[in-house]
């Protein structure tokens, strides 16, 4: 009856059994367990779990829990059973299972491992060698994301100054959920002497568009018309442009933020695919004006991480006045 049911809710359940942990892909850690032995028959089992630092508490009926995490440090999950979804209910004794990162000298692991998704078409990762590493270490970068069936090895290893790096194709797919996922990265050496380093790169962050390409500058009265080609792969609601105009005579430096704009004025070459236009007001036509443009992603599409594209090549219009 109701009273018995109520008693089973307050009664502490036995602990879960056979808690085990495994790694899938590069950074997907999965814990699984079995229901407790001898649980009350009128108990609808729920499992309470949290990570070692009491983070990410979860109460769910599934006998598994996974997390995407760079395996650079030990991570532990504690699991208990209970008869309701009530967080205030005391769960069974918590059982803990931990997973440690791969072995190796921490000083040998690469540092500053970071990746940028260039123009939604390729990802370029870079890192610094660890302190305890031989200078002739041959690095290998492995990567995985949801649209790959298996872990891939990055082939294009390069060196830029102190940094090593590697780039691989990563094209945005039409699947609307593609960018809700992440790329899992691991860097180690061929000889197995250094401790592997891991990183998880959310596809909503670290996006760097290609620079725009200025196609045309023209004057109409005292207005300067600028026409440029947008970077490919982005939808218009996800980008904005910074147009910088420098005037050689007045030494003024004007900056304008611009939404992707249709080329509707007669001064522009119209209906050209993937081009934007902007009118800079009040520009002196009889002086030299130099224009350059860069582009940034919108925070409503991609996380704010201060990554502008490189500047476009400069283009100038007008006459440079003699200093006499």
């Amino acid at each position: 009856d109701y009273k018995d049911d109520d008693e089973s809710r307050t009664e502490t359940q036995p602990p879960v059994t056979n808690l085990s942990v495994s790694v899938e892909n590069l950074c997907t850690v999965i814990w699984t367990w079995n229901p407790p032995e001898g649980a009350s028959s009128n108990c609808s089992l729920w499992y309470f779990s949290h990570f070692g630092d009491k983070q990410d508490k979860k109460i769910a009926p599934e006998t598994r829990r996974s997390i995407e995490v760079p395996l650079n440090e030990r991570i532990c999950l504690q699991v208990g059973s209970q008869c309701s979804t009530n967080e205030s209910e005391k769960p069974s004794i918590l059982v803990e299972k931990c997973i440690s990162p791969p072995e190796g000298d921490p000083e040998s692991a690469v540092t500053e491992l970071q990746c940028i998704w260039h123009n939604l078409s390729y990802m370029k990762c870079s890192w610094l060698p660890g302190r305890n590493t031989s200078p002739d270490t041959n690095y290998t970068l492995y990567y995985w994301h949801r649209s790959l069936e298996k872990i891939h090895q990055c082939e294009n290893i390069f060196r830029e100054g102190q940094y090593f790096g590697c780039s691989f194709d990563l094209t945005k797919v039409k699947d609307s959920s593609f960018e809700q996922h992440s790329v899992q990265i691991m860097v180690k050496d061929n000889a197995g002497k250094i401790k592997p380093s891991f990183n998880i790169v959310p596809l909503t962050s670290r996006v760097k568009p290609d620079p725009p390409h200025i196609k045309n500058l023209s004057f109409h009265n005292d207005d300067l018309y600028v026409q440029w080609e947008n970077p490919q792969n982005f939808i218009s609601r996800c980008l904005f442009y910074e147009v910088e105009v420098n005037n050689s005579q007045t030494e003024t430096h004007n900056v304008f933020y611009v939404q992707e704009a249709k080329c509707e004025n007669p001064e522009f070459e119209r209906n050209v695919e993937n081009t934007s236009c902007f009118m800079v007001p009040g520009v002196l036509p009889d002086t030299l004006n130099t224009v350059r443009i860069r582009v940034k992603t919108n925070k409503l599409c991609y996380e704010d991480d201060k990554l502008w594209s490189n500047w476009s090549q400069e283009m100038s219009i007008g006459k440079k006045r003699n200093s006499t």
Epitope: S236, E242, A261, K296, K299
Partner: antibody, heavy 118, light 104 residues
């Protein structure tokens, strides 16, 4: 000239539904986001959410997710904010604003005062 | 979630004086996204500054914005009678709580 014109003031009872509107003119309505902002009596501004009329993609502030629905009809350059069941705490001035990709609100409607009282 | 904290809550000044309003973000933000607004009683807000330092169309040059990272400032070089109002900073989905500039 960029203009956003909002529908008139509304007086409603708790539990009633409501849809207020914001009509844009003087610019390409489908190329800019439209944002909605709440201002409760004597209080500050609260960002509710945005819609991109070009493809009706919406983003809500976590505080307003599930509480309101933002929509748009690009054929008549109009954005909407609606409630299925109003509460007394929804009493506020609601502003729509044009929202470029860099996130500032560069043109505002005059505001719609919504009063919910039994 | 980013929190924007404005200070002071109220600034009492006389016309002709300089006003300095502060907006502090709980974590570093891109200056591209920081805006300032003015709101007078019974009116909709009006955009003053976007991109932390660019004046919006029609805004007098006595208004200027500066800052980067977590600290941003709106400066009104010489207060005019029509400048007494509430000022808000904003970064996408977050507004500061406002600073009221009142006549001393």
């Amino acid at each position: 000239e960029v203009q956003l014109v909002q529908s008139g003031a509304e007086v409603k009872k708790p539990g009633e539904s409501l849809k207020i509107s914001c009509k844009g003119s003087g610019y390409s309505f489908t190329s800019y986001w439209i944002g909605w902002v709440r201002q409760m009596p004597g209080k500050g501004l609260e960002w509710m959410g945005v819609i991109y009329p070009g493809d009706s993609y919406t983003r809500y502030s976590p505080s307003f997710q599930g509480q309101v629905t933002i929509s748009a009809d690009k054929s008549i350059s109009t954005a909407y904010l609606q409630w299925s069941s109003l509460k007394a705490s929804d009493t506020a001035m609601y502003y729509c604003a044009r929202f470029p990709n860099w996130g500032s609100m560069d043109a505002w409607g005059q505001g719609t005062l919504v009063t919910v009282s039994s | 979630e980013i929190v924007l904290t404005q200070s002071p809550g109220t600034l009492s000044l006389s016309p002709g004086e300089r006003a300095t309003l502060s907006c502090r973000a709980s974590q570093s933000i891109s200056s591209s996204y920081l805006a300032w607004y003015q709101q007078k009683p019974g009116q909709a807000p009006r955009l003053l500054i976007y991109g932390a330092s660019s004046r919006a169309t029609g805004i007098p040059d006595r208004f200027s914005g500066s800052g980067s990272g977590t600290d941003f400032t709106l400066t009104i070089s010489r207060l005019e009678p029509e400048d007494f109002a509430v000022y808000y900073c904003q970064q996408y989905e977050t507004f500061g709580q406002g600073t009221k500039v009142e006549i001393k």
